[in-house]
Interface confidence: low
Amino acid sequence: TIPPHVQKSVNNDMIVTDNNGAVKFPQLCKFCDVRFSTCDNQKSCMSNCSITSICEKPQEVCVAVWRKNDENITLETVCHDPKLPYHDFILEDAASPKCIMKEKKKPGETFFMCSCSSDECNDNIIFSEEYNTSNPDLLLVIFQ
């Protein structure tokens, strides 16, 4: 638990609290924007992103986007507000502690996206079907 005297934010945003009224700290996420990747045909991959960022706003979560087309594979790692769409998709799994990739329909490419809310959770992106949303652990909301 966060001691009550600790200041919440790294910026001047409105104080954000969780459902229990506890102050919510900004998330720590991998944040390398778009980088070329060698992650292909694997159950899980590390992001190979060396930049860990404090998200600008306390409500933001970690996001990873894996894209493959005829020319290359890229992996995008960012912070994003789950109330807003990203690449035109809603972040349905933002409360998950793990980044479980789900395929999205995008013409001309294979497109997977995941979001999660534990520190640096978008460093390990998981494609394996053994992780799925029927696992109650993945639905736990992480209160920082």
Epitope: V6, V10, F25, L28, F31, C32, D33, S50, I51, T52, S53, I54, E56, V78, C79, D119, E120
Partner: antibody
């Protein structure tokens, strides 16, 4: 007032060991990655080691791998660098530095005043 | 590892001069480039991060520019307290690496 104060430097013989400490105040230590950066006399800056905020991940420059170990005690707001099998080329001022990362941009700020390690027989 | 090369290694200038220091990366680092100032016997001090963002408390005569592999630190009007050594540093990939430094001396 953010402060980083290094200690533990000194003269040591080749093959010897030293443990550096960096006492931190003025910010919430447990939420930041930390690094050690060194500077040989009259030379430039060289990153040595880093540790994640929780302490579960570490990384070292190739020249110190297997010899140096970075650690932290978040309850004591202190960063450590255990240096074993010291060599003459490890002689340098060792700085601890707070790692900052916002919106994908990261940098070292602020830095401690440094502690001198001299490896000589 | 990404190599960072600064030029010149040293320069002599007078108070009021405009000073430019360049830093080149061995591969593209986007805008993941920081500049530090170090005075003798002191710790480095962050001046510019993310290639062009001025760190809080740093005088506006310092500015940074560049992207990809080529970067510049400019001091628009050199002041007596600016005589120091300046280092660039990439934060694009591990290990973070520094340039060899540029010493700015009084002419």
């Amino acid at each position: 007032q953010v402060q980083l104060v290094e200690s533990g430097g000194g003269l040591v013989q080749p093959g010897g060991s030293l443990r550096l400490s960096c006492a931190v105040s003025g910010f919430e230590f447990r939420r930041y990655a930390m690094s050690w950066v060194r500077q040989a006399p009259g030379k430039g800056l060289e990153w040595v080691s880093a540790i994640s905020a929780s302490g579960d991940r570490t990384d070292n420059t190739d020249s110190v791998k297997g010899r140096f170990s970075i650690s932290r005690d978040n309850s004591k707001n202190t960063l450590y660098l255990q240096m074993n099998s010291l060599r003459a080329e490890d002689t340098a001022v060792y700085f601890c530095a707070k790692g900052i990362a916002r919106s994908g941009k990261n940098f070292f700020d602020p830095w401690g005043q440094g502690t001198l390690v001299t490896v000589s027989s | 590892d990404i190599q960072m090369t600064q030029s010149p290694s040293s320069l002599s200038a007078s108070v009021g001069d405009r000073v430019t220091i360049t830093c080149r990366a061995s591969q593209s680092i986007s805008s993941y480039l920081n500049w530090y100032q170090q005075k003798p016997g002191k710790a480095p001090k962050l001046l510019i991060y993310a290639a062009s963002s001025l760190q809080s408390g740093v005088p506006s005569r310092f500015s940074g520019s560049g992207s990809g592999t080529d970067f510049t630190l400019t001091i628009s009007s050199l002041q007596p307290e600016d005589f120091a050594t300046y280092y660039c540093q990439q934060s694009y990939s591990t290990p973070p690496t520094f340039g060899q430094g540029t010493k700015v001396e009084i002419k």
